[in-house]
């Protein structure tokens, strides 16, 4: 599967829509800013082995989708843009799932994958707890939108890992 190419294209499109979703100037929400400790930004790219890159990206995409398809999310964003963003994520998820099914049996994913997956889940847990703490305020959602934009932007750094599979 030609994942690096398709993932990059879909990711660019999703990021563009996510940027358009902004409703508040970021500067007006400075007091609500939070570091959620995005795990794939703080780890060395070489740690993510090619066999674990797809499951990690899938989990990142799935958790993002869960976040933006929640009831609280639909009240926070423009419905048309939100639909478009979630559709892009759905397509990404399908691509990742297809590649993952092709990968199964080819190589046993390393145990280190468990660490990366748990780290991603903890990251999204911090985000959902933060939104709850802030009572899903418009500023809290803006902080989360900006955070997810950063996370999805960083996720393309895993693409070199995927390209290596074809070599």
């Amino acid at each position: 599967c030609d994942l690096p190419h398709t993932y990059n294209l879909r990711n660019k499109r999703a990021l563009k829509v996510l940027a358009q979703m902004r409703r508040l100037p970021f500067l007006s929400c400075l007091k609500d800013r939070q570091d959620f400790g995005f795990p794939l930004e703080k780890v060395d790219n070489q740690q993510i082995q090619k066999a674990q890159a797809i499951p990690v990206l899938r989990d990142l995409t799935q958790q993002t989708l869960n976040l933006f398809t929640s009831k609280a999310s639909s009240a926070a964003w423009n419905a048309t843009l939100l639909d478009s963003f979630c559709n892009d994520l759905h397509q990404q998820l399908n691509d990742l799932q297809t590649c993952l099914m092709q990968q199964v049996g080819v190589q046993e994913p390393p145990l280190t994958q468990e660490d990366a997956l748990l780290a991603v889940r903890k990251y999204f847990h911090r985000i959902t707890v933060y939104l709850r703490e802030k009572k899903h305020s418009p500023c809290a959602w803006e902080v989360v939108r900006a955070e997810v934009w950063r996370a999805l932007s960083s996720s393309v750094n895993l693409l070199p890992r995927l390209s290596e599979e074809k070599e």
């Epitope: 800013r33 939070q34 570091d35 959620f36 400790g37 795990p39 703080k42 780890v43 060395d44 740690q47 674990q52 390393p110 145990l111 280190t112 994958q113 468990e114 660490d115 990366a116 748990l118 780290a119 903890k122 990251y123 847990h125 911090r126 707890v129 933060y130 703490e133």
Partner: antibody, heavy 122, light 107 residues
Framework: EMQLMESGGGLVQPGGSLRLSCVAS????????MSWVRQAPGKGLEWVAS????????YYAPSVKGRFSISRDNSNNTLYVQMNSLGVEDTAFYYC???????????????WGQGTLVIVST | DIRVTQSPSSLSASVGDRVSISCQTS??????LNWYQQRPGKGPQLLIS???TLQSGVPSRFSGSGSGTDFILTIISLQPEDSASYYC?????????FGQGTKVEIK
């Protein structure tokens, strides 16, 4: 009894390298993230690095990133830190520490070794 | 990085006194704030995790409270063996950061 035993400390010249080891016993080593925390003599605590239970999800303090490398061998219940390009500011007691969860973040450091002293000096 | 500010840096109190140590973080860490005790010449020991959870074997005179950015460690009735340094630490995200420490002395 749960125990962590550090070794490998000693005197090293600035710019030199050192590898610290920590042998764990009394608990299921492969189920928990592990960290290194250091303390300069007479000073406070500084977290250095953490590694996930399966050897993935490695995190480093900004002061050591690019110089230190944390790793583990679950078959031998051993934690390591390879320290390169050491400077006088790295002089400290280095503690091997067990975390309460499988990967770092949203947890605590619930078991500490006695520490090994690293002195960087000419 | 999350800054952790602990106060006071030292205190002197009598046996039986109630003692409180404060810890503030530069952003919300929810409940992920831990307290450690370090006796002279020893490695630190976890006293309280997740702001208020007392660790097994730790005397009940120790208690922790707070959430978000403001936390307090309280020793209800100070004992001679409580003479030590106390550190708070945010375990919310890496890099983990510690407070500067509070040295507790017995008068």
């Amino acid at each position: 009894e749960m125990q962590l035993m550090e070794s490998g400390g000693g005197l090293v010249q600035p710019g030199g390298s050192l590898r610290l080891s920590c042998v764990a016993s009394g608990f299921t080593f492969k189920s928990f993230a592990m960290s290194w925390v250091r303390q300069a003599p007479g000073k406070g605590l500084e977290w250095v690095a953490s590694v996930g239970s399966q050897g993935g999800s490695k995190y480093y303090a900004p002061s050591v990133k690019g110089r230190f490398s944390i790793s583990r061998d679950n078959s031998n219940n051993t934690l390591y830190v390879q320290m390169n390009s050491l400077g006088v500011e790295d002089t400290a007691f280095y503690y091997c520490v067990k975390e309460t969860d499988a990967v770092a973040t949203m947890d605590a450091l619930d078991m500490w070794g006695q520490g090994t002293l690293v002195i960087v000096s000419t | 990085d999350i800054r952790v500010t602990q106060s006071p840096s030292s205190l002197s109190a009598s046996v039986g006194d109630r003692v409180s140590i404060s810890c503030q973080t530069s952003q919300s860490v929810n409940i992920y704030l831990n307290w450690y005790q370090q006796r002279p010449g020893k490695g630190p020991q976890l006293l309280i995790s997740a702001a208020s959870t007392l660790q097994s074997g730790v005397p009940s005179r120790f208690s922790g409270s707070g959430s978000g950015t403001d936390f307090i460690l309280t020793i209800i009735s100070l004992q001679p063996e409580d003479s030590a340094s106390y550190y708070c630490q945010q375990g919310y995200i890496t890099p983990y950061t510690f407070g500067q420490g509070t040295k507790v002395e017995i008068k």
